[in-house]
Interface confidence: low
């Protein structure tokens, strides 16, 4: 049956999916609060730009029937559920927010002939890779994997002369939805990042994780986890690790290293951690005093997903453009707009681009440094400490194999 | 090598003006923050005003409205216009720059932080304000 699109003649809405099974654990109202936040921000501005329409917001609720385990893993069918929803109501936005989940997002593609724009804060995986309507505003595995190909590759930075070709990756599948992806996107025999290694194994019990540390017949230096300091201790411990052993901890959503007084622990010395650069505005708005620093940014991307969707209106408004065309739903991409906290950049499949920061700990001062920024968007990696004070043999990154000299 | 050197220091009577300049050499990043640090005898260095590539602009809240950051490109120098100085304004004012910048928030951010790790800094310039 037709669904008509609450999109024309002044009055333009954004369809939000509120479902349980959500990227992060974040109550739903905070997720209200953001799109509210945006909403002002985006009547606003198009105020001032002499376009007297109204925008709104129609937040549709999954009633849980059918999964209700709050995980992503279990979300395949409650996209469709919802829009089973909307197609029963007769009534949608002119651009769908939601859902954050690889599963929903991914099956809702399969499913649907989606004609209109999907923003999702999430949907890390490498199967909502190219999507022509979806955009996400979360870093997406693919960008994950670039990163790492091109600082294994990189061999000319005074603190890292060696290319690396090789890696472990521990992967226990307790994850939460952006490292599981993530770390899939690595495990993945036919990603970007397996096809440039030469060596590259799996761990999947904690055991295995351990015997690594201080194995003299290890494959490779070189292990990639997914989480936050935390976690590493619960797996680590204060157990002993080899000299030459580096530890890479994706932990891309979570702002604590650039807090104040925050000190890294001992057992932090052999890890790099791969993180974002903070915002800033979110700290003191009305929305996100309750935030942890982790779901500051799944908040900040449904609320730059409305800004989005207000800069999009605003473009075809004064273009005098009609926004239920197929124009409509694939120009939500290659483009930069005004974020909540400055510009924002969209690839050309519609990805948001961000600089990502490589730490590492002091031991001069047991404070987190930033060692180096990538940036996304052009695939290009800046060093900003020239003289690190690491833990590793001569203020250098080790070789990812060992060299035992004749056996 | 990046070198940072400031210049335009100096003694001031309270309500007067005074203009920094920061003159950097070998610096190629094409993203960048980079402002003015200060460091009042006794106490923790702590950020005035900054500015990245974007052009995004932070200060301090205790000197808004009364110092204004800006840069000229073409002379590889940075400015920090200060009027309506008050006697705590005395401290050695360092020019500070790193290569880091996301969307100019990790510049801002710098702002709220006691002692900001930037990568690279100047030698400092003494301005006093008394009377």
């Known amino acids: 049956s037709q669904v008509s699109q609450n999109c024309h003649n002044g009055s333009y809405e954004i369809s939000v999916l509120m479902m349980d099974n959500s990227a992060f654990a974040e109550p739903l109202e905070n997720v209200e609060d953001a799109v509210n936040e945006g909403l002002e921000i985006v009547r606003g501005r198009l105020q001032n730009a002499g376009l007297n329409v109204t925008v709104n917001a129609s937040f549709m609720y999954s009633d849980g029937l059918i999964h209700n385990s709050g995980d992503c893993r279990s979300s395949t069918c409650e996209g469709l559920d919802l829009l089973r929803k909307i197609s029963n109501a007769k009534r949608m936005g002119c651009v769908l927010m939601g859902p954050s989940c690889t599963y929903s997002t991914f099956q809702m593609y399969l499913d649907t002939e989606l004609s209109y724009p999907m923003i999702s804060a999430g949907s890390f995986g490498l199967s909502c890779d190219y999507k022509e309507t979806l955009t996400r505003l979360m870093s997406p595995a693919r960008k994950l994997t670039y990163f790492l190909v091109n600082f294994w590759k990189t061999n000319d930075l005074p603190f890292k002369t060696y290319s690396w070709s090789t890696s472990y990756v521990y992967k226990n599948g307790t994850e939460s939805e952006d490292c599981f992806w993530y770390l899939n996107a690595l495990e993945a025999s036919v990603s970007y990042f397996s096809h440039e290694l030469s060596f590259k194994l799996v761990l999947r019990q904690d055991k295995e994780f351990q015997d690594i540390l201080m194995d003299h017949n290890r494959k490779s230096n070189v292990i990639v986890m997914c989480g936050g300091p935390e976690f590493l201790y619960k797996l680590k411990g204060d157990r002993a690790v080899a000299e030459d052993i580096v530890i890479i901890l994706v932990d891309l959503f979570n702002d604590q290293y650039f807090e104040d007084n925050v000190t890294a622990p001992d057992y932090m010395k052999n890890v790099l951690v791969l993180t974002q650069s903070p915002g800033n505005s979110l700290l003191n708005s009305s929305f996100s005093r309750n935030l942890s620093p982790t779901k500051r940014d799944f908040a900040l991307a449904y609320l730059n997903g409305i800004l989005l969707f207000g800069h999009m209106l605003k473009t075809f408004l004064e273009n005098g453009e009609n926004i239920t065309t197929p124009k409509f739903a694939h120009a939500f991409r290659n483009l930069t707009f005004e974020g909540y906290d400055g510009p924002v950049t969209l690839d050309d499949w519609g990805d948001v681009d961000s600089t990502m920061v490589l730490l590492y700990t002091s031991v001069d001062t047991k404070k987190y440094k930033v060692l180096l920024t990538y940036d996304t968007h052009v695939n290009q990696t800046n060093p900003v400490d020239m003289s690190p004070t690491f833990t590793w043999k001569n203020s250098k990154l080790p070789n990812d194999i060992t060299d035992r000299g004749p056996q | 090598e990046v070198q940072l050197v400031e210049s335009g220091g100096g003694v001031v009577q309270p309500g007067g003006s005074l203009r920094l300049s920061c003159a950097a050499s070998?610096?190629?990043?094409?993203?960048?923050?980079m402002g003015w640090v200060r460091q009042a005898p006794g106490k923790e260095r702590e950020g005035v005003a900054l500015?990245?590539?974007?052009?995004?602009?932070t200060y301090a809240d205790s000197v808004k409205g009364r110092f204004t950051i800006s840069q000229d490109n073409s002379k590889n120098t940075l400015y920090l216009q200060m009027n309506s100085l008050r006697a705590e304004d005395t401290a050695v004012y360092y020019c500070?720059?790193?290569?880091?910048?996301?969307?100019?928030?990790?510049?801002?951010?710098?702002?709220?932080?006691?002692?900001?790790?930037?990568?690279?800094w100047g030698q400092g310039t003494l301005v006093t304000v008394s009377s």
């Open positions: 500070a720059a790193d290569a880091v910048n996301w969307y100019g928030s990790i510049c801002a951010s710098m702002i709220r932080r006691k002692n900001p790790a930037f990568g690279y």
């Open positions: 070998g610096y190629t990043y094409s993203r960048y923050c």
């Open positions: 500015i990245a590539s974007d052009g995004t602009t």
